[in-house]
Amino acid sequence: CKAMHVAQPAVVLASSRGIASFVCEYASPGKATEVRVTVLRQADSQVTEVCAATYMMGNELTFLDDSICTGTSSGNQVNLTIQGLRAMDTGLYICKVELMYPPPYYLGIGNGTQIYVIDPEPCPDSDF
């Protein structure tokens, strides 16, 4: 297993609709054809997997049908979008990249993106 540098923004504020997008960029040392991207969430010392996708270079990322993540790839960059976020989902989202094929296997883990999510203010009660 060889180490690889992964860069991602430090802080991002999700949209009022609970959507956060960020780029995860990896310094590929070779010509990988198969890449796996995993998003991990760290909060209160717990790390949980948010979503994961394996893709062939030049193809779309395919997450599971019920995944809250979508993404596109371009060269050594992966543009990740996480949807359906609420204030309780605020936390550190870490991008993990694995170059699966061809060998050697490379692993890179970013420093994480602190995603802040603001629940929208409830609408004031209407008289109508």
């Epitope: 802080v11 991002v12 204030a87 605020t90 936390g91 603001i118």
Partner: antibody
């Protein structure tokens, strides 16, 4: 080294607007946020809101909602805070700070005086 | 919104003494997203501690932070003349990001 340099002191009349700038250097501007904090004379720190320089999304303190607008110019790594309909109790030193979650670097402050 | 309460309001001590400042949150601060700042008259605040216990760059080791959940403490092991200032705690785990009212450490 990281630096945040704010625009100079302003004197405004009640009802007017003020726009304070915060020019940053020494770090990747779009990877972080910029927050604005104010301090009335002899008082504590009041958080006004922040902007994510990565995507331009904003989050304002409820009491200032509708009167404050925070923006960024990524081409010059500069953040702006505009406060409208100024009142005498808006007289304060206004600080910008870099958001890494916590506020790790601060501007020198801009005194805004609201007086008729 | 998370309300932070600091105590005491003023702490009168002599150089060389130990200072213990308290910050209590109205609800749990997630992932210990609590910071401490020092402010001297006419100056901008300066970050001392983040993540409840991590010292910011360039901060001397006489400053230490501890605590989790709703109770946090800033300790200055031996007060130096330059440490007499106002100290604020702040939570950045949930919006709105809130500050405590501050504790003034002055010379006895």
């Amino acid at each position: 080294q990281v630096q945040l340099v704010q625009s100079g002191a302003e004197v405004k009349k009640p009802g007017a607007s003020v726009k304070v700038s915060c020019k940053t250097s020494g770090y990747t501007f779009t990877s972080y946020g910029i927050t604005w904090v104010r301090q009335a004379p002899g008082q504590g720190l009041e958080w006004m809101g922040w902007i994510s320089a990565y995507n331009g999304n904003t989050n304002y303190a409820q009491k200032l909602q509708g009167r404050v607008t925070m923006t960024t110019d990524t081409s010059t790594s500069t953040a702006y805070m505009e406060l409208r309909s100024l009142r005498s109790d808006d007289t304060a030193v206004y600080y910008c700070a870099k958001v890494s979650g916590y506020f790790d670097y601060w501007g020198q402050g801009t005194l805004v005086t609201v007086s008729s | 919104e998370i309300v932070l309460t600091q105590s005491p309001g003023t702490l009168s001590l002599s150089p060389g003494e130990r200072a213990t400042l308290s910050c209590r949150a109205s609800q749990s601060v997630s992932s210990s997203y609590l910071a401490w700042y020092q402010q001297k008259p006419g100056q901008a605040p300066r970050l001392l501690i983040y993540g409840a216990s991590s010292r910011a760059t360039g901060i001397p080791d006489r400053f230490s932070g501890s605590g989790s959940g709703t109770d946090f403490t800033l300790t200055i092991s031996r007060l130096e003349p330059e440490d007499f200032a106002v100290y604020y705690c702040q939570q950045y785990g949930r919006s709105p990001f809130t500050f405590g009212p501050g504790t003034k450490v002055d010379i006895k």
